[in-house]
């Protein structure tokens, strides 16, 4: 059959009419509409928004249009009892406390249902105690205040700055050092950048604002109550006590202006460098405790919100393939958001519904893609990546026989820089090749492509003339796409610089501040960033779902597993004299990626000899390419991780956001150096070693000649 | 067993720079703050500066009027002090300690400047 | 700056008499004080950190106490190998500050 048989226009042709209908003034005015109201997860105006969604997908023309609905456990403040912080003297009267709700930008006044600033899945309670400052609390800042500073944060309030990592990762870190509560701050060194007014006359963080988000640590194990399964009607529900991932101590995040009168009283110690002094105009010592005249003064809590089970929907649309409908490329986007969404989700719902309803155009004219496309408007991805986990979990079989892509579609800006880009290897030709052939919306870049603006801006750090693309780690949708069912994902969005700013995220992110108004006024003004992100993502969808030969490079793979094997190699070799004595060797893994390498290279001659007008022959090739990236997964998942399955990338243990390559073996060897039994702890290294080695080899052998 | 080793006595001019190491084994190295401490012949003990190794994060004494810089080679575990437009008075034993309450001192450097 | 102020200058203590030793900080350090022994020739030693925790290793015939401004390093019996200068810093803020230190020898 010819190659065109799902359409009545060329290839080319389809991809350039698909492009051309994509509108800068239609995503304005689908972000406009999106953001109006907010739309937090679990209220009647998101479930009203789901249904305003499928109604208008249906409208563009897909093929059919459903809502997918899970009880699954949210959590909100009290509205008559509300969380605060309190400075109290030694009478316990509150001699200082926290604002309750964020000053209202302009024209938005009125508005209902704007949640307070919470840190959701917080439990309740009021303790107080002496503060200890423990830096954005990482990983690291833990050492430093207990090995180093020798300072014990067992029974004190911790406060920390947003950045560097995600919040859940601060908050069971604080746990494990026996904190008995968290107070999360937004410090101006993270989340002002220097030259550039506060909202609402630049894009920054006014002193009153406060980042929202989930404390969970799920790890990708979705609704808390019922994790590897759907929270449907018959679902079984945990007890609250046996609820994966919720956190144990009471947290409650706070603007500046409030982080000012807690920690220009700090006593204690100094703070130990540099690195731990934010911008106000405090010491920023670490504690415990306040100074001087304030010794007998204390901190205390007053949280009072519930978790509670509560209905959550989907949306999802679906566009049949005409030559492979059983084959499965997938855009999805979060659509519920902390307030108003300006940014996080509704400038990628905007996005995502521009594409649909292209999609929808071609679709009207006789045109369909050559496999099937899904379009997913998640719920409940601000309260633990809920909605798109439900939804794999009841789905599983068929994305994991089916499933050739999954692109996701939050936030399509973070600043107006340049691209961003995180993805499989698979993916990295086709995202070259895409950037090539887009107009880069960057100034001082007229008439080039976008790929030159971008390799330009970011390139990467091991290939010269190439851009930058990272790996993907979690805290999104792809999450239980790509790290527990194996199917190849990325995403794109417009970035800041970051070499010139080091705040942490965008500044008003999660804030009653993430307003249309910011986006229209201070980030992208002719929504040109936004285009350029609708046709990445757009671009990289219809590829996936029309090239008649899937559009994966398992080469790229190669390379990257020789780098990672080579990275996880240099950190074992700094303990060469344990590798001796416990005769770790890397070479089964260094072996099983040279016979990774020489497959993938034998595999992609094959892909460009053979008989591509053989359908069978055509659809056995691009399986062994779908299921490429399945074979990375190991279905007993990673140690205390099991949602985690994939062997080559998982999100960090120390920050949710970031991906570790070969997570195995790097936990294995983390902070090995203090483990009470080295024999132990060395053996779980050599394990490890074999898991990798022998998922890469198997992986490999999916490569080879089928007979 | 912690060690902290300093390079040698080092004899410089004024208006010279003086770059002392200080190579560090039996703990990990990211994990301690590095301090650099100066005694003047029969004097007290004078702080300088310090170091994050993780992440080269430093605080000088403002004394030092830029001065001194401090940096650190995770590679090699090993940290520096430098300090420059050195004066007669800049003559004294250079230490380095390790850890946040200078848990474990080096064995001293002398530096002498001498016209 | 914070001036850490020692006294005395010097110390003659007999042996297994008890030795005290005082550091006053110009204002409140909360209890960010730490105590340093020095021998003739030989580079400092931490033997108190957090103004009264004993360093690994360090006899227990030394003990640190105070908070605020006023701060004590007591000997309570002391040593032939106790002799040497004792310094006293503050690390509550910078530059981190030390006493002129005490000699302690043998009556």
């Known amino acids: 059959k010819s190659s065109n048989e799902a359409t009545n226009i060329t290839p080319k042709h389809n991809m350039k009419a698909f492009l051309d209908e994509l509108k800068a003034e239609n995503i304005k005015k689908f972000l406009y509409n999106f953001t109006q109201i907010p739309h937090l997860a679990g209220t009647e105006q998101n479930f009203q928004l789901a249904k305003q969604i499928q109604s208008q997908w249906k409208e563009f023309g897909l093929d059919s249009v459903e809502l997918a609905h899970y009880d699954v456990l949210l959590s909100y403040p009290n509205k008559t009892h509300p969380n605060y912080i309190s400075i109290i003297n030694e009478d316990g009267n509150e001699i200082f406390n926290t604002s309750l709700f964020e000053p209202p930008p302009p024209g938005y006044e009125n508005v209902s249902d704007i949640v307070p600033p919470f840190s959701a899945f917080s439990p309740q309670g009021m303790p107080e105690g002496d503060l200890v400052y423990v830096n954005y609390a990482r990983t690291e800042d833990f050492f430093k205040l207990e090995r180093d500073m020798k300072i014990n944060c067992s029974g004190k309030i911790v406060i920390a700055r947003y950045g560097k990592v995600f919040r859940g990762n601060k908050v069971k870190n604080a746990q494990l050092a026996g904190a008995k509560g968290v107070i999360l701050y937004s410090d101006p060194a993270d989340y002002f950048a220097p030259g550039v007014k506060s909202y609402p006359d630049g894009w920054n963080l006014p002193g009153g604002g406060v980042q929202r988000g989930n404390i969970l640590n799920l790890n990708g194990a979705g609704d808390p109550l019922t994790p590897g399964y759907p929270a449907n009607e018959y679902a079984y529900r945990r007890g609250i006590a046996e609820a994966v991932g919720l956190p144990s101590i009471p947290v409650h995040p706070i603007g500046y202006y409030d982080a000012q009168k807690l920690l220009e009283k700090m006593g204690g110690s100094a703070p130990p460098d540099s690195s731990w002094r934010g911008s106000l105009k405090v010491p920023y010592n670490v504690g415990p405790g306040f100074t001087g005249n304030f010794s007998t003064q204390k901190v205390k809590m007053h949280i009072h919100s519930t978790n509670e089970v509560t209905r959550i929907y989907n949306v999802i649309g679906t566009l049949r393939g005409a030559v492979e409908p059983d084959r499965y490329v997938i855009l999805g986007g979060h659509r519920d958001s902390w307030v108003f969404g300006g940014i996080d989700p509704q400038s990628g719902a905007a996005v995502v519904h521009e594409i649909v309803r292209s999609f929808g155009t071609l679709k009207k004219e006789g045109w369909r893609p050559r496999r099937t496309i899904l379009f997913a408007s998640w719920d409940a991805e601000e309260f633990g990546l809920l909605g798109s986990t439900e939804w794999a979990e009841e789905n599983s079989r068929l994305l994991q026989e089916r499933g050739v892509a999954y692109i996701n579609a939050d936030s399509s800006i973070e600043g107006n820089y340049t691209l961003r880009v995180d993805c499989t290897p698979l993916m990295y030709s086709l995202v070259h090749n895409l950037t090539k052939e887009l107009k880069s919306p960057d100034e001082g870049f007229e008439g080039k492509s976008l790929y030159e603006s971008w390799t330009k801006k970011s390139p990467s750090p091991e290939f010269s003339g190439m851009p930058r693309i990272s790996k993907l780690g979690s805290g999104n949708d792809f999450e239980v796409f790509f790290q527990r069912l194996g199917i190849a994902s990325g995403r794109a969005r417009y970035t800041k610089n970051w070499e010139t700013n080091k705040f942490s995220g965008y500044p008003l992110y999660h804030s009653v501040y993430e307003t249309y108004e910011l986006v229209e006024k201070f980030y992208d003004p002719m929504f040109k960033y936004h285009l350029t992100v609708a046709q990445v993502r757009g671009g990289m969808v219809f590829e996936l779902a029309n090239s008649i030969v899937l559009p994966f490079d398992c080469r790229d793979y190669a390379v990257v597993l020789r780098k990672y094997a080579d990275k996880i190699y240099s950190i074992s070799m700094k303990h060469p004299q344990e590798m001796k004595t416990y005769s770790v060797s890397f070479d089964s893994l260094f072996s099983a990626v040279k016979n990774f390498t020489e497959i993938a290279s034998k595999f992609s001659e094959r892909l460009q000899d053979f008989d591509k007008s053989n359908p069978i022959v055509l659809r056995m090739m691009n399986d062994q390419l779908m299921f490429l990236e399945r074979a990375f997964i190991d279905p007993l998942g990673l140690p205390d991780r099991p949602f985690y399955r994939h062997v080559i990338y998982a999100p960090s243990s120390h920050n949710k956001y970031a991906g570790e390559s070969f997570p195995g073996i790097y936990d294995a060897l983390f902070d090995i150096e203090s483990k009470v039994d080295p024999s132990k702890a060395w053996g779980e290294v050599k394990r490890q070693i074999y898991v990798a080695a022998f998922t890469v080899q198997a992986a490999a052998e999916t490569l080879s000649e089928v007979a | 067993e912690v060690q902290l080793v300093q390079s040698g006595a080092e004899v410089k001019k004024p208006g010279a720079s003086v770059k002392v190491s200080c190579k560090t084994s039996?703990?990990?190295?990211?994990?301690?703050?590095i301090h650099w401490v100066r005694q003047a012949p029969g004097q007290s003990l004078e702080w300088m500066g310090n170091?994050?190794?993780?992440?080269?994060?430093?605080t000088y004494n403002q004394k030092f009027q830029g001065r001194v810089t401090i940096t650190v080679d995770k590679s090699t575990s090993t940290a520096y002090m430098e300090l420059s437009s050195l004066r007669s008075e800049d003559t004294a034993v250079y230490y380095c300690?390790?850890?946040?309450?200078?848990?474990?001192w080096g064995q001293g450097t002398l530096v002498t400047v001498s016209s | 700056d914070i001036v850490m102020t020692q006294s005395p200058d010097s110390l003659a203590v007999s042996l297994g008499e008890r030795a005290t030793l005082s550091c006053r900080a110009s204002?409140?350090?909360?209890?960010?004080v730490d105590w340093y022994q020095q021998k003739p020739d030989q580079s400092p030693k931490l033997l108190i950190y957090?103004?009264?925790t004993r360093h690994t290793g360090v006899p227990d015939r030394f003990t640190g106490s105070g908070s605020g401004t006023d701060f004590t390093l007591t000997i309570s019996s002391l040593q032939a190998e106790d002799v040497a200068v004792y310094f006293c810093?503050?690390?509550?803020?910078?530059?981190?500050?030390f006493g002129a230190g005490t000699k302690v020898e043998i009556k």
């Open positions: 204002q409140d350090v909360g209890t960010a």
């Open positions: 300690a390790a850890g946040w309450n200078f848990d474990y």
């Open positions: 170091i994050n190794p993780n992440n080269g994060g430093t």
């Open positions: 039996g703990y990990t190295f990211t994990e301690y703050t």
């Open positions: 957090w103004a009264s």
């Open positions: 810093k503050q690390y509550n803020s910078y530059p981190l500050t």
